[in-house]
């Protein structure tokens, strides 16, 4: 008779999270008499996975009826796969005895799992940063299955090139994980802006999973001040105006000097967002000149999303006191416009929270 | 390892019956069929029936259609042949046995269940 | 019913010699290159034992000096050299369809 050969006829089989895996093996001989019993792995450390002869294997189901005249099917089923039981998996004759002995085993069949990568989460940077700095997003996915994978980056639809992408284990792994880091060069108009963390993999049929972040959690527009002085009134008060514009977010505190001297402190709140998603605030002071003997040196300072002060300063004339002047004609405007904080030339006189 | 256990005697009245017990251990019960065998005071093997614990499906020789019924308790690993309508004929020691090639042969055997039908 | 004839129904073989039993079926056992013949061995107040299974196949655990041969109808077992344990009954089973046994053969050792 001839000499009893186990066949595995497939070399590698690939099977969804969550399927069912179909491992083949044919006996070539009724001889001899002895169960099949299947391996994941070789050696000393190899798993049972199943046994003709014995065990309670609640997973695994002979796919022909092991009780079926003459048999020499022994493919089994595997149900509800998942990425740990990827492996090597032997199917091994044993020749009856007390106990039986090992005979022959097949050659192999590879199961691989196709394990879909967990949606992609894109984190921003800690603290923000202001226009012309880069920041840094990241980008992780998870527990996908082979290692194969595609990460793109997009901001408002346009792809970044500058990024760097790892995929862990190097080695050979039941699953991996991706992560990426991106360097986005944030501009003033970024305010609505949205960088995209885009994944592609076998298991998603070439429907990417997406993960996004929004600018808005990473920008800071700091604000322009501009302090004008309306018509001095009839009661001899003057109108004095800080129109504090384009800024991001909307946490702001404007605090008004006379000579140096606080006179009020405002927060701001619930302001109207400009179409690029900045705020503008505007803040009167009325002065009454007839109260000074002196020009009244009035500073607007502005605190924003906790940096240090800007401020920015006007001097009322009470020297001149013609009722019916225009705009700025008793005023000196003395302030500069300190959106730059580092070219501050009034940082001594700031207040630092 | 693979072990069949049978009580050793039942002594029964004529026209009676029996369920003679075979409790398989050392193996999964399920996976292999189960036959029965009588075998009379000096003579010779008589293949009775086989039974598949998996399914119940059974296999009588026709002398014994009316005599036999197989069945099993797989929760308790347990297969079972009821002899009905017992005679003096049926006084014999009656074997079970495990196929454990699926050759419908006969690996394993219990030690036997001696019947004596005698009133 | 395939009827499996055995022969001779007992015999005495001296201790070291050869016994040769026959087994003969009134069809043919064989299919897809298998003789469904086993042979088995029983001693008084014992369950039978299997021997030889497929014609030709020594079970696990069973001396060398058992043999089986044959093909189609006709089925040998032979035991070489005979000892002393070796007293006991000898049936053959065939299984091309559902089983039946041959009637014995009792091997007495001189």
């Known amino acids: 008779e001839e000499e009893l050969q186990v066949i595995q006829p497939e070399k590698s089989v690939s099977v969804a999270a969550g399927e069912s895996a179909t491992l083949n093996c044919t006996a070539t001989s009724l001889i001899p008499v002895g169960p099949i019993q299947w391996f994941r792995g070789v050696g000393p450390g190899r798993e049972l996975i199943y046994s003709q002869k014995e065990g309670h294997f609640p997973r695994v189901t002979p796919v022909s009826d092991p009780t079926k005249r003459n048999n020499m099917d022994f493919s089994i089923r595997i149900s509800n796969i998942t990425p740990a039981d990827a492996g090597t998996y032997y199917c091994v004759k044993f020749r009856k005895g007390s106990p039986d002995v090992e005979l022959k085993s097949g050659a192999g069949t590879e199961l691989s799992v196709r394990a879909k990568p967990s949606a992609p989460v894109v984190s921003g940077p800690a603290v923000r940063a202001t226009a012309e700095h880069t920041v840094s997003f990241t980008c992780e996915s998870h527990g996908f299955s082979p290692r194969d994978i595609t990460l793109k980056w997009f901001k408002n639809g346009n792809e970044l090139s500058d990024f760097q992408t790892n995929v862990d284990p190097a080695g050979k792994s039941v699953s991996y994980s991706i992560r990426s880091t991106a360097r986005v060069v944030l501009t003033r108009r970024d305010v609505h802006s949205q960088v995209i963390c885009e994944v592609a993999h076998v298991t998603l049929q070439g429907d990417p999973l997406r993960g996004t972040a929004n600018l808005s959690e990473a920008i800071r527009v700091p604000p322009f001040l501009e302090v004008t002085q309306q018509s001095m009134r009839a009661d001899n008060q003057v109108n004095v105006t800080c129109q504090v514009t384009k800024f991001y977010p909307q946490r702001l505190q404007l605090t008004w000097l006379e000579n140096g001297n606080v006179s009020r402190t405002e927060m701001a709140s619930a302001l109207p967002e400009n179409k690029d998603g900045t705020y503008n605030w505007t803040s009167w002071l009325l002065v009454n000149v007839s109260a000074h003997r002196d020009d009244v040196k009035l500073t607007c300072q502005v605190e924003h999303d906790g940096q240090p002060a800007v401020n920015k300063s006007f001097s009322v004339k009470v020297s001149a006191h013609p009722k019916e002047q225009g705009s700025n004609t008793a005023a000196e405007n003395t302030g500069t416009n300190e959106r730059d904080y580092k070219d501050d030339d009034d940082k001594h006189h700031h207040h630092h929270h | 390892q693979v072990q069949l256990q049978q009580p050793g005697t039942e002594l029964v009245r004529p026209g009676a019956s029996v369920k003679l017990s075979c409790k398989a251990s050392?193996?999964?019960?399920?996976?292999?069929?189960i036959n029965w065998v009588k075998q009379r005071p000096g003579q010779g093997l008589e293949w009775i029936a086989m039974?598949?614990?998996?399914?119940?499906?059974?296999h009588y020789n026709q002398i014994f259609k009316d005599k036999a019924t197989l069945t099993v308790d797989k929760s308790s690993n347990t297969a079972y042949m009821q002899l009905s309508s017992l005679t003096s004929g049926d006084s014999a020691v009656y074997y079970c046995?495990?196929?454990?090639?699926?050759?419908?042969?006969?690996?394993?055997w219990g030690r036997g269940t001696s019947v004596t039908v005698s009133s | 019913d395939i009827v499996l004839t055995q022969s001779p129904a007992s015999l005495a073989v001296s201790l070291g010699q050869r016994a040769t039993i026959s087994c003969r079926a009134s069809?043919?056992?064989?299919?897809?290159?298998?003789?469904?013949i086993f042979w088995y061995q029983q001693k008084p107040g014992q369950p039978p034992k299997l021997l030889i299974y497929l014609a030709s196949n020594l079970d696990s655990g069973v001396p060398a000096r058992f043999s089986g041969s044959g093909s189609g109808t006709d089925f040998t077992l032979n035991i070489h050299p005979v000892e002393e344990e070796d007293a006991a009954t000898y049936y053959c089973q065939h299984s091309r369809e559902l089983p039946t046994f041959g009637g014995g053969t009792k091997l007495e050792i001189k």
């Open positions: 039974i598949d614990p998996s399914d119940s499906e059974t």
């Open positions: 050392g193996y999964t019960f399920t996976n292999y069929w």
């Open positions: 046995a495990m196929d454990y090639g699926s050759l419908y042969a006969m690996d394993y």
């Open positions: 069809k043919s056992v064989s299919s897809s290159g298998y003789n469904y």
